[in-house]
C-alpha cells in the first residue's frame, strides 16, 4: 500500500556473485550491486527474494527506491545504510519480509531524504528504542520519515523478550521526539492488547493511523483529542466491545477523521446505549451499517444501527443472599 | 490543489430540466461527501443536499424543499458530480455551488466552486 | 429544520475597529461537544469562504483578525481590527442536522 514504488524502465542485473562483498572504493555511478536489479532512469533498486544476508555496500548514490524485500537480512546494526558519499536521494525504503529479528540504534542513520520506511512482516524480537532516531539524547534531530510501515512484526511468543512487546514499539516511536513530522503510520496485525496512552500526543502530524487487526479491548486511555490532522482511523479486527463517551466525543471532534471499526466484537448491553446514540448521528464512522453485535448471545449479528434503549440491558447483579452456587 | 468546477447552467422554460455537473480534482474524490448549495440574486444560501462518499456507500440526503424533484449522483471514475433538476420553477432560478465537505462532514464545507447559473423563465 | 437567525442584517464598522455577528440557533447544534457551526465570507461574483468551522476553529490560511465563539445555541464571528479587504456578505451555517441550514446573512460595510 504505501511501500516504495518503482517505474518499470530498463532494469539492468549485475553478475551474481556474493553482495555482502565490501568495496573499498565508493561504487561507480553506474554500477548495481549483485543480486539486484537498478534503473537509473527510476531512481530504484530492487534486491528482492535473494536470500542476501547484509544490506549490499555498494548501492548507486542515485537510489531513491530500494526494495531489499524477501531477504534473510536478520539483523540491521547501526549504520547499516551510511555510505561515503552518503545514500543522500534515498526516499523509499522496503525490507519487509526479510526475516528481520533485530534492528539496532542507527541503523537508518544518515539517510538524510528517507521519508518512507516500510519493515513490515519481519519478526521484530529486538528493536531498539533508538532505531528511528538514531541517538539517545532526550531530544533528537527530527527524522525526516512521514511514512512508517509497520505490519505484522510481532516475533512468535517463543522468541518474544521478556517485555511488553506494544512498549518495545511505542519507545522505538516516541524516543528523542525523533518522528513529529510523522504522517502515517501502520502497526497493524501485531496483537496490540493495548496502545500505551502516551503514543498519540507525542505524534501530532498523523494523518493515517492503522491499527487493524490487533486484539485491542478498549479504548479508554487513549486520547485523540491533539490528533487535529488525524484523517483515517483503522479500528478494524480488533477486540473492541464498546466506546465510551469520552473517545467518542473525541473522535467527533476531529475535523478530517474517517473511522473503521468493522469486524469487533460488540458487547450490546446497557454500556452500549451511548455508542449506539452516537452511531445513529454520527458520520465520520464508515460502513457504520455493518457493525453487528457478538454478545450477548440473543443479541448475536444484530445491527447496532438498528438497536433501541428497550434493547440494551444489563443483568442485574443479584445480592449474595439470593446467588445460588 | 483542490478545485471544482460547475457547468450545465443556462435558461430553461418552467416544468423543463436541467443537469449540472461538477469536475472535482486535486483529491481523492472517493474519500468524500460532496453537496450542491444554491443562492438566489441578493438572496441567502440554501442547502440542497449531499452524496456521502465511498465509505458510507453513496447514499444521499436531500433538502424537503427540492425532494422528488432533484437528484444528487456522481461519477466516480471521472471524478464529477452531478444535480439533476426536473421540472423546474422560477423560484429555483438561482447561482448553483457545488461543494466538498471536509473529512469529518459534520464540519461542512470546506471547498465550493465558482457557481453556476439556473434560469428558470419562460 | 434548525433556523439560523442572523444579526444584525448589515453593520458599518470604522476601518480598524471591532465587527461582531451574532448567530442563534432554533435548537442546540451541539454533538458530543462540539458546536457544529460554520461561518463564511462571501464577496459579490465569488463563492463563499469558509473562515471558521466548529464555531471557533479558524480556518487554514484566513487571518488572526477574524474569530468565533459560542456554543450551544448562540454564537458569535468577530473581525479585530476591520480592514477594507473584509467588506463582504458573512453566513452562519450549521452542519449539526440535515437538512444543513445557513442564516439570512450580514453586510459588512465599512463606515
Known amino acids: 500500500s504505501s511501500s516504495p514504488t518503482s517505474s518499470a524502465s530498463s532494469f539492468s542485473s549485475s553478475a551474481p556473485f556474493l553482495a555482502s562483498a565490501v568495496s573499498a572504493q565508493p561504487p561507480l555511478p553506474d554500477q548495481c550491486p549483485a543480486l539486484c536489479e537498478c534503473s537509473e532512469a527510476a531512481r530504484t533498486v530492487k534486491c528482492v527474494n535473494r536470500n542476501l544476508t547484509e544490506v549490499p555496500t555498494d548501492l548507486p548514490a542515485y537510489v531513491r527506491n530500494l526494495f531489499l524485500t524477501g531477504n534473510q537480512l536478520a539483523v540491521l546494526p547501526a549504520g547499516a545504510f551510511a555510505r561515503r558519499p552518503p545514500l543522500a536521494e534515498l526516499a523509499a525504503l522496503n525490507l519487509s519480509g526479510s526475516r528481520l529479528d533485530e534492528v539496532r540504534a542507527g541503523a537508518f542513520e544518515h539517510l538524510p531524504s528517507l521519508r518512507q520506511l516500510d519493515l513490515s512482516h519481519n519478526p521484530l524480537a529486538d528493536l531498539s528504542p533508538f532505531a528511528f532516531s538514531g541517538s539517545n539524547a532526550s531530544v533528537s534531530a527530527p527524522s525526516p520519515l512521514v511514512e512508517l510501515i509497520l505490519n505484522h512484526i510481532v516475533p512468535p511468543e517463543d522468541e518474544r523478550q521478556n517485555r511488553s512487546f506494544e512498549g518495545m514499539v511505542v519507545a522505538a516511536l516516541l524516543a528523542g521526539r525523533a518522528l513529529q513530522g510523522l504522517r502515517r503510520l501502520e502497526l497493524a496485525s501485531n496483537h496490540f492488547l493495548y496502545l500505551p496512552r502516551d503514543v498519540l500526543a507525542q505524534l501530532p502530524s498523523l494523518r493515517h493511523l492503522d491499527l487493524s487487526n490487533n486484539s485491542l479491548v478498549s479504548l479508554t486511555y487513549v486520547s485523540f483529542r491533539n490528533l487535529t490532522h488525524l484523517e483515517s482511523l483503522h479500528l478494524e479486527d480488533n477486540a473492541l466491545k464498546v466506546l465510551h463517551n469520552g473517545t467518542l466525543a473525541e473522535l467527533q471532534g476531529l475535523p478530517h477523521i474517517r473511522v473503521f471499526l468493522d469486524n469487533n466484537p460488540w458487547v450490546c448491553d446497557c454500556h452500549m446505549a451511548d455508542m449506539v446514540t452516537w452511531l445513529k448521528e454520527t458520520e465520520v464512522v464508515q460502513g457504520k451499517d455493518r457493525l453487528t453485535c457478538a454478545y450477548p448471545e440473543k443479541m448475536r449479528n444484530r445491527v447496532l444501527l438498528e438497536l433501541n434503549s428497550a434493547d440494551l440491558d444489563c443483568d442485574p447483579i443479584l445480592p449474595p443472599s439470593l446467588q445460588t452456587s | 490543489e483542490v478545485k471544482l468546477v460547475e457547468s450545465g447552467g443556462g435558461l430553461v422554460q418552467p416544468g423543463g430540466s436541467l443537469s449540472l455537473s461538477c469536475a472535482a480534482s486535486g483529491f481523492t474524490f472517493t474519500d468524500y461527501y460532496m453537496s450542491w448549495v444554491r443562492q438566489p440574486p441578493g438572496k441567502a444560501l440554501e442547502w440542497l443536499g449531499f452524496?456521502?462518499?465511498?465509505?458510507?456507500?453513496?447514499?444521499?440526503e436531500n433538502s424537503a424543499s427540492v425532494k422528488g424533484r432533484f437528484t444528487i449522483s456522481r461519477d466516480n471514475s471521472q471524478s464529477i458530480l452531478y444535480l439533476q433538476m426536473n421540472a423546474l420553477r422560477a423560484e429555483d432560478s438561482a447561482t448553483y455551488y457545488c461543494?466538498?465537505?471536509?473529512?469529518?462532514?459534520?464540519?461542512?464545507?470546506?471547498?465550493w466552486g465558482q457557481g453556476t447559473s439556473v434560469t428558470v423563465s419562460s | 429544520d434548525i433556523v439560523l437567525t442572523q444579526f444584525p442584517a448589515s453593520l458599518a464598522v470604522s476601518l480598524g475597529q471591532r465587527a461582531t455577528i451574532s448567530c442563534r440557533a432554533s435548537e442546540s447544534v451541539e454533538f458530543y461537544g462540539t458546536s457544529f457551526l460554520q461561518w463564511y465570507q462571501q464577496k459579490p461574483g465569488q463563492p463563499p469562504k469558509l473562515l471558521i468551522y466548529g464555531a471557533s476553529n479558524v480556518e487554514s490560511g484566513v487571518p488572526a483578525r477574524f474569530s468565533g465563539s459560542g456554543s450551544g445555541t448562540d454564537f458569535s464571528l468577530s473581525i479585530h481590527p476591520v480592514e477594507e479587504d473584509d467588506i463582504a456578505m458573512y453566513f452562519c451555517?450549521?452542519?449539526?442536522?440535515?437538512?444543513?441550514?445557513f442564516g439570512g446573512g450580514t453586510k459588512l460595510e465599512i463606515k
Open positions: 461543494a466538498r465537505y471536509r473529512g469529518n462532514p459534520h464540519y461542512a464545507m470546506d471547498y
Open positions: 452524496i456521502r462518499n465511498k465509505g458510507n456507500g453513496y447514499t444521499t
Open positions: 451555517q450549521q452542519s449539526r442536522k440535515v437538512p444543513s441550514t
